[in-house]
Interface confidence: medium
Amino acid sequence: YDFTNCDFEKIKAAYLSTISKDLITYMSGTKSTEFNNTVSCSNRPHCLTEIQSLTFNPTAGCASLAKEMFAMKTKAALAIWCPGYSETQINATQAMKKRRKRKVTTNKCLEQVSQLQGLWRRFNRPLLKQQ
């Protein structure tokens, strides 16, 4: 999916008002320096691509993020403010419904959410030069 035509300011507002708090809650009890940010993005569409991938694609050691509240809010924001996004997600949604994995917080998931926090911060500061 091409995130170029999303309403970035509305997505940013959703992040600042609520998604950010959910990410902090998920990471509670974890030191902010515990994980190094290894995933980066260069502009807002690229950041949303990376955010979508890390949030919804199961990875080795962390298959359960899609059921978290921050993930569902992210999905809702993308569906609402990115034209045509929903249509691209229907097959993925059906597959996820079939899997229905139970939520398990692993160290790998914590690391992944730490990466997400970095990507969201980058999304909110699109004019900063890439490190």
């Epitope: 008002s17 959910d22 509240m69 569902m72 809010k73 999905k75 809702a76 929903s86 949604t93 996820m96």
Partner: nanobody, 112 residues
Amino acid sequence: EVQLVESGGGLVQPGGSLRLSCAASGLTFSTTVMGWFRQAPGKEREWVATIAGDGSTFYADSVKGRFTISADNSKNTAYLQMNSLKPEDTAVYYCADINEDWGQGTLVTVSS
């Protein structure tokens, strides 16, 4: 199997109010995200409002300040309180969950 049933639609005069309900079975409201959408005759379905399980809400600019979305987790029901209704609010109103399970819709007609 998720089932969503909307109710509360009807005919109302401009400036009037209606409260729509969306009763859900097969899902847990407190851990999901619910939305209201509408489709006017001859137009595409458009998003109206969203509420998450923790109570956070989002609104389309066209209804902000007039419509209020809420949920009663104990009843697994979402609500859309619509005030200061305008003729352009006339549409079939649908609720949907995050996995895009849809209700059958309820018709709201704003006319004098």
